[in-house]
């Protein structure tokens, strides 16, 4: 369960892949599409508001709260829209929603090699946001083999002006 209803911290960042492609968001036919693309030099990177929450693991050996604390994150590229996992379609979608956000909008944050991060579905452990055919998709990861898979690695770059459209 999420420890508190308020995030412990928030940050504005641009999101890019391990291979330095940008994650961009475009309004098309009254809905948002998510793209993975090489940005032209003069084009500004899209920003995402990341809100970080603490969460306890479902079961705790010691029961004293020290054990099993996770860092969860929600990602919002524009006001009232959040990235959500669609586990049936193995897709990542942008949906307009009100708080409290659904579980599909929460991802367990993993720090990775090369100072990258990965986002694991709260609703489907072992399934991560990844890159597939220039789009974001949900990718099942074999923990024993593919934890370093480049297609689930993302970079966060700080954006200093803290307003959020």
């Amino acid at each position: 369960s999420i420890t508190g209803i308020s995030p412990i911290t928030e940050s504005l960042a641009s999101l890019s892949t391990y291979n330095d492609q940008s994650i961009t968001f475009a309004l098309e036919d009254e809905s948002y599409e998510i793209y993975v693309e090489d940005l032209k030099k003069d084009k500004k990177k899209d920003k995402v508001l990341l809100s970080y929450y603490e969460s306890q693991h479902p079961s705790s050996e010691s029961g004293d709260g020290v054990d099993g604390k996770m860092l969860m994150v929600t990602l919002s590229p524009t006001k009232d829209f959040w990235l959500q996992a669609n586990n049936k379609e193995h897709s990542v979608e942008l949906h307009k929603c009100e708080k409290p956000l659904p579980d599909q909008a929460f991802f367990v944050l993993h720090n990775r090699s090369f100072n990258c991060v990965s986002f694991e579905c709260k609703t489907d452990p072992g399934v991560f946001i990844g890159v597939k055919d220039n789009h974001l998709a949900l990718i099942k990861v074999d923990y024993s083999e593919n934890l370093g898979s480049e297609n689930i690695l993302f970079k966060l770059s700080e954006i200093h002006h803290h307003h959020h459209h």
């Epitope: 911290t9 970080y52 004293d64 054990d67 604390k69 996770m70 944050l109 024993s144 934890l147 200093h160």
Partner: antibody, heavy 122, light 107 residues
């Protein structure tokens, strides 16, 4: 009670080797990323190495890369630091420390052992 | 590597005083900064994480603020047990790096 207990510190000659151990209790060790941090006499804290809960990912400070190896045995709730090619600059108190978050180092280190002393001198 | 610079390196204060320690990162680290207290012969103790979150069990006279590159630890009213060395630590990226420490001494 959540506890980390280090052992293995000793007086060693330059060029020698030592293996430090850290035994954990009171929490699910296999979930927790772990670290070694040291403090040399009269100096500040220096992060040495870190390892993921599964042991699949390891990280090192440049000052120890190629000489030190971090590892863990989750069946024994034990963290290790194999230290080779020791020099006087490695003289320090060595602490093992647990990451606050199971999958992220963003939260700092919330549980520390009391430390074990390594002295490298001829 | 990210360099962490603390100031002052030492400070003398009296019980009841308000004390502020600053920490600057050589590049942006979002809010991923932790503060520790270490007393002679003891292990470091986590006080603040994520720049401003108070670690469980730590007295509320300790507070943290900042984001990006500039951070502050404030002790609102010094108690006798607060005299120690304080370290900041960036938790944004490996290698993890600490500030050089601030020694808080009794005036």
């Amino acid at each position: 009670e959540v506890q980390l207990v280090e052992s293995g510190g000793n007086l060693e000659q330059p060029g020698g080797s030592l293996r430090l151990s850290c035994t954990a209790s009171g929490f699910t060790f296999s979930r927790s990323a772990m670290n070694w941090v040291r403090r040399a006499p009269g100096k500040g804290l220096e992060w040495v190495s870190g390892i993921s809960g599964s042991g699949g990912r390891t990280y090192y400070a440049d000052s120890v890369k190629g000489r030190f190896t971090i590892s863990r045995d989750n069946s024994k709730n034990t963290l290790y630091l194999q230290m080779n090619s020791l020099s006087a600059e490695d003289t320090a108190a060595y602490y093992c420390a647990k990451d606050s978050y199971t999958t992220s180092w963003y939260g700092g280190m919330d549980v520390w052992g009391h430390g074990t002393t390594v002295t490298v001198s001829s | 590597d990210i360099q962490m610079t603390q100031s002052p390196s030492s400070v003398s204060a009296s019980v009841g005083d308000r004390v502020t320690i600053t920490c600057r990162a050589s590049q942006g680290i979002f809010s991923w900064l932790a503060w520790y207290q270490q007393k002679p012969g003891k292990a470091p103790k986590l006080l603040i994480y994520a720049a401003s979150s108070l670690q469980s069990g730590v007295p509320s006279r300790f507070s943290g603020s900042g984001s990006g590159t500039d951070f502050t630890l404030t002790i609102s009213s010094l108690q006798p047990e607060d005299f120690a060395i304080y370290y900041c630590q960036q938790a944004n990226s490996v290698p993890i790096t600490f500030g050089q420490g601030t020694r808080l001494e009794i005036k």
